[in-house]
Interface confidence: low
């Protein structure tokens, strides 16, 4: 028997520095977790102790903090090279700055193979990107070889900006021939490494003949055997065992997100490359693991540019941006309108001639808006200003919901109106009318939504049975502020871009902003 140790990360999302337990900014260093310096300590410790070790990343290193905003992927290549990753799969967020934003900072700079079997380049891009990413890579490990085959969510064109010259094929259809090719090369130990979410990971394990292990990402799935060490609730045991259609037991793993854990999987293969045992658990990278001093020093050096950036002007406002709780928790506020407009703008994807855009709606809990911005400071808006408005380090995500769920959400928005509670919704692409004289649960008297399948966008009544795409904070997608119906009834959830980054990019693009209160939210009775 031959033993392989797979160390893996996924959905790190720009968390190069250590973070608090909830993966936001580190405040009390003695209780902070993750970060590349701490990760390196643990990886090196395992490399020294065990003979056959692979360090893999399942995508979405890009996007999530000011590190990505400033360094645009150069930081990913630099620190992944320093940690000596063996391979990475492309995630959807790797395309957030377009194909160029992937090629220049990462694909050309990485000293490790970057993989995806189901992304096919066409047209002029085909020759430009040729060889910069691969469908698979055969890696020597000790006296053996291991094949790594990559995959990426086929939803990427709706979630990011890959352009028109990349085709995202069905994962299973694309993977099978590549695995077959590896078999003809006498590679009998094959890992599928990719970024399509836990459901697809399990399907790959079931359907793709010849895949021995699946290392996934995208769904931020936490798996654990035994008592979990932090706040994350396991979605199943680690590894999660899938019985393939040809009767094999295939381990599937994922390691939550944000570099909080290092996935640790030990696989035993027989001489024919069959998995005979698999066990392990994610390792919580808490403060009991010291940060590596050389990597930490490098982080501190790169950090200097970030501090300078956060005080630079992004753009100007010529109006007061009312982010006060007195406004945003009671009525339409122009800060809410600004943020929602930025959220929609960030999701403009012209993927179908019948649709002006794939999504037109935004909802945002008023309680998530934490500060106004005064225009009398020369109109200047900085990253620092925006960090006061959106201090929680969340993301603006894409969900699919039935109209009936949206209706429930808007009823919940005003079910205890008047108590300055955070669930009052700010909106974009939605016109809502409330009648507060009616009983809670029956206060939405009009709910019109902006069409997407139209050349001239206009507002139509919400249809209860129709499925709509909506951009909203991850906090709401996860049922925060009592929006349990969203969490319970959402039909799809894809995590999006860092909230501050979305708004800062929009302001930089617009240069001068003047959001108004324009009748998106109305009250049919009372003095509102």
């Amino acid at each position: 028997a031959w033993e392989l140790t797979i160390l893996h990360t996924n959905d790190v999302h720009s968390r190069l520095e250590q973070t608090s337990e909830d993966s936001s900014k580190c405040v009390n260093a003695s209780r902070c977790m993750g970060g590349v310096a701490r990760l390196f300590t643990k990886v090196q410790q395992i490399r020294r102790a065990e003979p056959n070790v692979l360090l893999l990343d399942a995508g979405d290193q890009y996007q999530g903090t000011i590190w990505f905003t400033v360094y645009k992927g150069a930081e990913v290549a630099h620190f992944m090279n320093a940690l000596r990753y063996d391979a990475m799969a492309l995630g959807n967020h790797e395309f957030d700055n377009g194909v160029e934003g992937l090629i220049e900072p990462l694909l050309k700079e990485a000293k490790f193979p970057i993989l995806s079997a189901n992304i096919k380049a066409k047209g002029p891009l085909a020759s430009q990107i040729s060889g910069l990413y691969l469908p698979y890579k055969v890696l020597p490990v000790g006296d053996e070889v291991v094949g790594i085959v990559g995959y990426t969510s086929k939803e990427t064109p709706f979630l990011s900006n890959p352009g028109t010259n990349l085709v995202f094929e069905d994962e299973i259809t694309a993977l099978q021939p590549e695995v077959d090719k590896l078999k003809t090369l006498n590679v009998n130990k094959i890992i599928a490494l990719g970024h399509s979410g836990f459901e697809m990971d399990k399907l790959i394990a079931q359907k793709v003949r010849g895949v021995d292990v699946v290392v996934g990402g995208h769904s931020n799935t936490f798996l654990y055997t035994g008592n979990p060490p932090s706040k994350e609730v396991p979605a199943g045991k680690y590894p999660f065992i899938v019985t393939s259609d040809d009767g094999r037991k295939v381990p599937v793993v994922q390691a939550y997100a944000f570099g909080k854990y290092l996935g640790y999987l030990k696989i035993e293969f027989d001489e024919r490359g069959n998995v005979i045992s698999s066990h392990g658990n994610p390792i919580l990278l808490n403060s009991s693991i010291p940060e590596d001093p050389s990597i930490k020093a490098d982080i501190n050096k790169w950090r200097i540019k970030l501090d300078n950036y956060s005080t630079q002007e992004l753009g100007k406002t010529i109006v007061y941006l009312d982010g006060s709780s007195q406004s945003c928790r009671f009525r339409e506020c122009n800060m809410g309108n600004l943020i929602c407009d930025a959220m929609i703008n960030n999701n403009l994807r012209h993927t179908d001639e019948m649709f002006w855009n794939h999504v037109s709606m935004c909802i945002l809990n008023g309680g998530g808006i934490r500060s106004p911005i005064d225009e009398r400071n020369n109109g200047t808006i900085t990253w620092e200003n925006l960090a006061a408005v959106l201090p929680f380090g969340g993301t603006f995500d894409l969900v699919q919901l039935k109209g009936s769920t949206l209706k429930k959400a808007f009823e919940h928005s005003v079910h205890r109106y008047g108590q300055s509670t955070g669930e009052f919704l700010q909106v974009g692409g939605i016109h809502v009318v409330y009648d507060l004289s009616r009983k809670p649960g029956d206060r939405v008297v009009k709910l019109d939504v902006l069409c997407t399948k139209c050349r001239v966008p206009s507002y139509d009544p919400l249809k209860m049975d129709e499925v709509y795409k909506v951009i909203l904070p991850n906090f709401l997608a996860n049922g925060g502020d009592g929006f349990q119906m969203i969490k319970d009834e959402l039909l799809r959830h894809d995590s999006g871009d860092q909230d501050i980054n979305v708004v800062s990019t929009y302001i930089s693009k617009m240069k001068v902003i003047y959001p108004a209160v324009e009748g998106r939210i109305k009250f049919s009775t009372g003095s509102h």
Epitope: G441, G482, L491
Partner: antibody
């Protein structure tokens, strides 16, 4: 440990209103994410979800019974109350209260209380 | 509302047998399905949630699978204490249950 106990009348007359109380321990309905629901089961028949209430007083009802049901909570007493108006013999069932988990499945149940509707 | 059609409504099996119960949802419920065991005069007990995850303390002979509209519940080796009625429940929209499968020993 988590326990739930239902209490209320064993017999109600047709057209009357049924009031059931669920008294629980081992968790608090003021904790974010907590919910308690009611499910009933007519003799020899399947289970039917009726209503549930969340920590923040958000309430959900089975649409086919919504007009007859009211759910409320008293956090300080660790109680949830369900009222059902205009009772009919077809409402004869064992009524259970249960703690609703992260999604909408129920891990902890009371032992149930049999309510018979008869004149 | 979403109907859950469970089959068979009753079945008889011997100790050690592999037992399979199926449940079909009237529309896509993704993996939002739970399975319960109910013994006479007792409250139901959850065995499986999210279609395939065993609840803590549930013996490994119980398993679940499926997604979308078709779900399967399996007892790999029937034990005498498994005699009960089993229910599926979807929670993609407001909860609805299957009509139950009564399991008896031959």
């Amino acid at each position: 440990q988590v326990t739930l106990r239902e209490s209320g009348p064993a017999l109600v007359k047709p057209t009357q209103t049924l009031t059931l109380t669920c008294t629980f321990s081992g968790f608090s309905l003021s904790t974010s994410g907590m919910g308690v629901g009611w499910i009933r089961q007519p003799p020899g028949k399947a289970l039917e979800w009726l209503a549930h209430i969340w920590w923040d007083d958000d309430k959900y009802y089975n649409p086919s019974l919504k007009s007859r049901l009211t759910i409320s909570k008293d956090t300080s007493k660790n109680q949830v109350v369900l009222t059902m108006t205009n009772m009919d013999p077809v409402d004869t069932a064992t009524y259970y209260c249960a703690r609703r988990e992260r999604w909408a499945w129920f891990a902890y149940w009371g032992q149930g209380t049999l309510v018979t509707v008869s004149s | 509302d979403i109907q859950m059609t469970q089959s068979p409504s009753s079945l008889s099996a011997s100790v050690g047998d592999r037992v399979t119960i199926t449940c079909q949802a009237s529309q896509n419920v993704f993996t939002n399905v739970a399975w319960y065991q109910q013994k006479p005069g007792k409250a139901p007990k959850v065995l499986i949630y999210s279609a395939s995850y065993r609840y803590s303390g549930v013996p490994s002979r119980f398993s679940g699978s499926g997604s979308g509209t078709d779900f399967t519940f399996t007892i790999s080796s029937l034990q005498p204490e498994d005699i009960a009625t089993y229910y599926c429940q979807q929670y993609n929209s407001y909860p609805t249950f299957g009509q139950g499968t009564k399991l008896e020993i031959k």
